[in-house]
């Protein structure tokens, strides 16, 4: 289904076995440290009311939040994966820098705000949960933006 032309990532970004593997390994390691299995950040509530053509823009917001407010504060943990995955995700973020939507993004901002509030409310364990869902972030970015 169509996306804003600037809200697009080349599929080749997701076809690099080494960094894909490292992203999933980082997620797996963090999820082992996540003791709050009742909450899912990247799930139905995040996308509710967001049309297919706006899903990449939403994922851009989630990616930027994850980089700035989750991965950077936790950058000394989960090595060596973290030091390899952060530059990769930063590259994806840069590629989406000109991704905007023309219509009203109020619902998107509401959904992203809810995710941010959940992470903040959980404190450090919220950050660990977000890292543990990097596999879902990766796949959702791919599905929404390619």
């Amino acid at each position: 289904l169509p996306v804003n032309t600037r809200c697009k990532l080349e599929v080749s970004n997701f076809q690099q076995p080494y960094i894909v593997n490292r992203t999933f390994m980082l997620a797996k390691e963090a999820s082992l440290a996540d003791n709050n299995t009742d909450v899912r950040l990247i799930g139905e509530k995040l996308f509710r009311g967001v049309s297919a053509k706006d899903q990449c823009y939403l994922m851009k917001q989630v990616l930027n939040f994850t980089l700035e407010d989750v991965l950077l504060p936790q950058s000394d943990r989960f090595q060596p994966y973290m030091q390899e995955v952060v530059p990769f995700l930063t590259k994806l973020s840069n590629q989406l820098s000109s991704c905007h939507i023309s219509g009203d993004d109020q619902n998107i901002q509401k959904n992203v705000r809810r995710l941010k509030e959940t992470v903040k409310k959980l404190g450090e364990s919220g950050e660990i949960k977000a890292i543990g869902e990097l596999d879902l972030l990766f796949m959702s970015l791919r599905n929404a933006c390619v």
């Epitope: 289904l1 169509p2 599929v11 997701f14 990247i42 799930g43 139905e44 996308f47 509710r48 009311g49 967001v50 049309s51 297919a52 053509k53 899903q55 879902l136 796949m139 959702s140 791919r142 599905n143 929404a144 390619v146």
Partner: antibody, heavy 116, light 112 residues
């Protein structure tokens, strides 16, 4: 949260038929909806989808043969010119995007028989 | 369009036993695979998505695994109520929307 199809009946080839999917417990402004069909004794076949913003997309084989539209609480599937090959149970389902599309819940289906 | 090839029907096992159903995709679909259960006269019911995530209310006896092109649904501690046809379903993104959703041909499970 539930969906239910209606409008299935016996029709003669070439007679247009509209099926209706009525939703309750959720809003069509929050979820896309899909139509899937199943011929007797056969597997599942995706027909098309109507997105939250009203955009419609169809399987390549279904283009021109089906039209999907909606109101605030219903989603219609029009079979423009039925043939005997369109005899099937027609299902509608809610599309929950969770980073990948998943279909849940489904309606019980409505049977369309095309015969002269 | 992606083609999904499932284990041939029927697959049978005794009550308390285990069955394994395979689903092979003709191209890499990452983990964009779901499994549905359909009993005669009923609509499909979502069991698993993201290849391995259990849908709400589905017993842990159902287990999905795999990624890329090879996927498996395993049902352990079989119950009579598990007798049904199981379908895998793929989502393919980035191509034209007219081939986005594909179902496998289905695998019938018989519980003896």
């Amino acid at each position: 949260q539930s969906v239910e199809e209606s409008g299935g009946r016996l029709v003669t080839p070439g007679t247009p038929l509209t099926l209706t999917c009525t939703v309750s417990g959720f809003s069509l402004s929050s979820y896309a909806m899909i139509w899937v069909r199943q011929a007797p004794g056969e597997g599942l076949e995706w027909i098309g989808i109507i997105d939250i913003d009203g955009s419609t997309y169809y399987a390549s084989w279904a283009k021109g043969r089906f039209t999907i539209s909606r109101t605030s609480t219903t989603v219609d599937l029009k079979i423009t010119s039925p043939t005997t090959g369109d005899t099937a149970t027609y299902f509608c389902a809610r599309d929950r995007f969770v980073g990948v599309d998943i279909f849940d819940p489904w309606g019980p289906g409505t049977l369309v028989t095309v015969s002269s | 369009a992606v083609v999904l090839t499932q284990t041939a029907s029927p697959v049978s096992a005794p009550v308390g036993g285990t069955v394994t159903i395979k689903c092979q995709a003709s191209e890499d679909i990452y983990t964009n695979l779901a499994w549905y259960q359909q009993k005669p006269g009923q609509p499909p019911k979502l069991l698993i998505y993201w290849a391995s995530t259990l849908a709400s209310g589905v017993p842990s006896r159902f287990k999905g695994s795999g990624s890329g092109t090879e996927f498996t649904l395993t049902i352990s501690d079989l119950e009579c109520a598990d007798a049904a046809t199981y379908y895998c379903q793929a989502c393919v993104y980035g191509n034209s929307a007219d081939s986005r959703y594909t179902f496998g041909g289905g695998t019938e499970v018989v519980v003896k």
